[in-house]
């Protein structure tokens, strides 16, 4: 990982700014999609639509597919339902930090972070706290930039996600993602 903190010239797929822009687009699209599937019209989620290029569209489709699979994991849903959202920032950062506490980074965990953020957003919608939505997106992007950005750069940018989940065994990887998030939530409950 380059320690210079400088942005690579030309804003290619591994530049800090490009990774953050794409990450923001993916997160926004993922959350809007999850909310839409709940059937709830959420004007709070009507964030500025940004045209997606073919690569980002592919990535979005990949995230949707994983999200659907995670939605059907009952154990994970039960754990998320039990999350106390009285102090959502504390919960978010503790669970996020725990997911990566062993220093091992992989795309499954990045997706687990997005999925957890989407679930917190949906809870905010259900409890009529719409102002939390942009806030949760902000927390997710902050964590992404400070903890995951260097690793994503090392993978050649977001396109590495497609090859990670582009195998015939992507369902197996999704089970792993659910396991990571469930474990982090379990630890958080014990600590909380």
């Amino acid at each position: 990982m380059d320690g210079s903190g400088e942005q690579p010239r030309g804003g290619g797929p591994t530049s800090s700014e490009q990774i953050m822009k794409t990450g923001a687009l993916l997160l926004q699209g993922f959350i809007q999609d999850r909310a839409g599937r709940m059937g709830g019209e959420a004007p709070e989620l009507a964030l500025d639509p940004v045209p997606q290029d073919a690569s980002t569209k592919k990535l979005s489709e990949c995230l949707k597919r994983i999200g659907d699979e995670l939605d059907s994991n009952m154990e994970l849903q039960r754990m998320i339902a039990a999350v106390d959202t009285d102090s959502p920032r504390e919960v978010f950062f503790r669970v996020a930090a725990d997911m990566f506490s062993d220093g091992n980074f992989n795309w499954g965990r990045v997706v687990a972070l997005f999925y957890f953020a989407s679930k917190l957003v949906l809870k905010a919608l259900c409890t009529k706290v719409p102002e939390l939505i942009r806030t949760i997106m902000g927390w997710t992007l902050d964590f992404l930039r400070e903890r995951l950005l260097g690793w994503i750069q090392d993978q050649g940018g977001w396109d590495g996600l497609l090859s990670y989940f582009g195998t015939p065994t992507w369902q197996t990887v999704t089970i792993f993602v659910a396991g990571v998030l469930t474990a982090s939530l379990t630890i958080w409950k014990k600590m909380g």
Epitope: S16, K21, S101, G138, R145, E146, G150
Partner: antibody
Framework: EVQLVESGGGLVQPGGSLRLSCAAS????????IHWVRQAPGKGLEWVAS????????YYADSVKGRFTISADTSKNTAYLQMNSLRAEDTAVYYC??????????WGQGTLVTVSS | DIQMTQSPSSLSASVGDRVTITCRAS??????VAWYQQKPGKAPKLLIY???SLYSGVPSRFSGSRSGTDFTLTISSLQPEDFATYYC????????????FGQGTKVEIK
Amino acid sequence: EVQLVESGGGLVQPGGSLRLSCAASGFNISYSSIHWVRQAPGKGLEWVASISPYYGSTYYADSVKGRFTISADTSKNTAYLQMNSLRAEDTAVYYCARSHFGALDYWGQGTLVTVSS
Amino acid sequence: DIQMTQSPSSLSASVGDRVTITCRASQSVSSAVAWYQQKPGKAPKLLIYSASSLYSGVPSRFSGSRSGTDFTLTISSLQPEDFATYYCQQWGYSHSHLITFGQGTKVEIK
């Protein structure tokens, strides 16, 4: 070249207000995070507040919550720290810094804030 | 809140000495720990990020490591320009702080 320049410090009476500015160049603050860190005379570093302008995430230390407000104008590539109800214990050199990979990689030169009657 | 307890608070050493400064986190933290050097009247300078990554332009005599909740900055062979105050820093939201600094270690000439 990445650069951060603070301004706005000075002498103010207890209960007074000041607004500090942090002008950034060489990078876009929209996709970054800007922090204010202060250092009282002869003391260590204390994190004060931070902002991530893209979604407007803001964070504050308990010691300044409700009194200080961090903001940013991305069109000017500048972050601000509005300090109200100032106390003697707020006297310090205030630095703005950019974070990258969880570390503060670029710092300004600092601006001195003195709260005294 | 996560506390970063830095030790020692000061130390005296000679040029060429190996110097070790430790920061202990009060609870399990991620590897988002950084080390800075500060000289009087100047802004801090980043030395190490992500616990053990050497920042660009920093001499290789500086290194960082992690063992559980203990984070260590080592200067393998102290140089005249290394006499300064060193701070550790942790990133990660904890109740009231996004960033937490250690109390600092002043490295003086013996």
